[in-house]
């Protein structure tokens, strides 16, 4: 049986970005018809992970997995089920807690983003890493880059691959 | 609010292993009082990720996140809720689908393990990577190493940090 997953294309893109794999990122972005400016924006984020080395990939992957498997995300599934007691209401949508984290990463202040990460993983080294990545992204990305990244995320969330 | 997570120490260990970070692995293993033979076993698994390079860390992190956020794992939460319509029945236990994958990684055949991964992520590159890692683990780990890894996993699953 092939299991339905929670927005697989999102995780494909996230892991390609976080692990600095440009070829994998290009492949994933092609699947959602990313424009050139959207690709540029994602590559700037990828550069931040690469510059901050292996530890940043470990820790941010850990944060993403922790949020994705947290009660917040589980709670989404639970809410749907409570409403009509049928498992098949459980969509493949990305969990709002994940979406919120990504939005804050792009448009929030460093404090807002770190505060959201701290709800899931309060280890000082994780929070320090989150702040470094956020500061890097703010330094590298113009407002337009961030808008392009958000428009790409909308494509991802509404893609048939999600 | 600090959210309860699904067995955080498990993901700490998994990401430390998969990302080849020996210091992080040692820190995580100390938290669950790992014995020397258990550490040796985990370091052999870590060697496989390191030897297979960045792509293996990307892809296996992706598989783990995909399974952890799949309907199978969400379904666990849903089941609990359907039974008594209370969100707080949602435990911090590791999802059985994740547990099953790890067990097959250690004690199953390569075909059995790849088949289980394919239920969540059927990309050929992902499955090829899963097979390479599984073959590597089978080549490096003695039967006793595998038993030590399983005993460490039991410590993790029953730890107060899970």
């Amino acid at each position: 049986v092939k299991m339905a997953e929670t927005c697989p294309i999102f995780y494909d893109v996230f892991f390609a970005v976080a692990n600095g794999n440009e070829l994998l990122l290009d492949l994933s972005l092609t699947k959602v018809n990313a424009t050139e400016p959207e690709r540029t924006a994602m590559k700037k984020i990828q550069d931040c992970y690469v510059e901050n080395g292996l530890i940043s990939r470990v820790l941010d992957g850990l944060v993403m997995t922790t949020i994705s498997s947290s009660k917040d995300c589980m709670g989404e599934a639970v809410q749907n089920t409570v409403e009509d007691l049928k498992l098949n209401t459980l969509g493949r949508e990305i969990c709002p807690a994940v979406k919120r984290g990504v939005d804050l990463f792009l448009t929030g202040t460093p404090d807002e983003y770190v505060e959201q990460v701290a709800q899931y993983k309060a280890l000082p080294v994780v929070l320090e890493n989150a702040r470094i990545l956020k500061n890097c992204v703010d330094a590298k990305m113009t407002e337009e880059d961030k808008e392009n990244a958000l428009s790409l995320l909308d494509k991802i969330y509404t893609s048939p691959l999600c | 609010v600090k959210m309860a997570e699904t067995c955080p120490i498990f993901y700490d260990v998994f990401f430390a292993v998969a990302n080849g970070n020996e210091l992080l692995l040692d820190l995580s293993l100390t938290k669950v009082n790992a014995t020397e033979p258990e550490r040796t076993a985990m370091k052999k698994i870590q060697d496989c990720y390191v030897e297979n390079g960045l792509i293996s860390r990307v892809l296996d992190g992706l598989v783990m996140t995909t399974i952890s956020s799949s309907k199978d794992c969400m379904g666990e939460a849903v089941q609990n809720t359907v039974e008594d319509l209370k969100l707080n029945t949602l435990g911090r236990e590791i999802c059985p689908a994740v547990k099953r994958g790890v067990d097959l990684f250690l004690t199953g055949t390569p075909d059995e393990y790849v088949e289980q991964v394919a239920q969540y992520k059927a990309l050929p590159v992902v499955l090829e990577n899963a097979r390479i890692l599984k073959n590597c683990v089978d080549a490096k780990m003695t039967e006793e190493d595998k038993e030590n890894a399983l005993s460490l996993l039991d410590k993790i699953y029953t730890s107060p940090l899970c």
């Epitope: - | 033979p37 052999k44 060697d47 030897e51 004690t107 199953g108 590597c136 080549a139 490096k140 003695t142 039967e143 006793e144 190493d145 595998k146």
Partner: antibody
């Protein structure tokens, strides 16, 4: 046909280091489907496994608890041999020492001829 | 460590007779994941190294005569020589290889009566 040829001194003084070498022909020390072992045999202890080295993209060693603090087994890929070093020997270490190949890390399918090592006090 | 106990210590039989050697392990050497018994049998003649006869409890090594066979599972194993020959005079050892520390039985000496 795999052959193992042992060499090293037959007499070692107490508290010194016992050193033996096992030369391999017909196989490679860095083969990834075998392990290279040292075993000893004495009337008091019978057959006693001491340790092994094996290559699986990198080198690994396992040692018997009874000798762990004073044993070293080292491969030499350039000479296609592996060696045993046992430090701080006592008369109880007097035995016939064998090198042997294990398929994977399982049964011992090829053995060296054995070397009687006497530790004198 | 797994302790291997052999019985009897010695065995004196007539040529052509059936010789049976027992080996008991202190823990099971059956690995549940592949259903294999991690046990071997060796023959050692005076002044020679041990020679592998049987592995996986019952698989004969090439060149070993078929009058020699191994059986058993879990903790109890047997080496049988169906018709004893003069060249079978030796000491026989069982060995487990399930654990990282390999261990041997104390040996059974087979002689001609």
């Amino acid at each position: 046909q795999v052959q193992l040829q042992q060499s090293g001194p037959g007499l070692v003084k107490s508290s010194q280091t016992l050193s033996l070498t096992c030369a391999i022909s017909g196989d490679s020390v860095s083969s990834n489907s075998v392990a290279w072992n040292w075993i000893r045999q004495s009337p008091s202890r019978g057959l006693e496994w001491l340790g092994r080295t094996y290559y699986r993209s990198k080198w690994y060693n396992d040692y018997a608890v009874s000798v762990k603090s004073r044993i070293n087994i080292n491969p030499d890929t350039s000479k296609n041999h592996f060696s045993l070093q046992l430090n701080s020997v006592t008369p109880e270490d007097t035995a016939v020492y064998f090198c042997a190949r294990a398929w994977n890390w399982y049964y011992l399918d090829y053995w060296g001829q054995g070397t009687l090592v006497t530790v004198s006090s | 460590d797994i302790v291997m106990t052999q019985s009897p210590d010695s065995l004196a039989m007539s040529l052509g007779e059936r010789a049976t050697i027992n080996c008991k392990s202190s823990q099971s050497v059956l690995y549940s994941s592949n259903n294999k018994n991690y046990l071997g049998w060796y023959q050692q003649k005076p002044g020679q190294p041990p020679k592998l006869l049987i592995y996986w409890a019952s698989t004969r090594e090439s060149g070993v005569p078929d009058r020699i066979s191994g059986s058993g599972s879990g903790t109890d194993f047997t080496l049988t020589i169906s018709s004893l020959q003069a060249e079978d005079v030796a000491v026989y050892y069982c060995q487990q290889y399930l654990r990282n520390t390999l261990t041997f039985g104390g040996g059974t000496k087979v002689e001609i009566k």
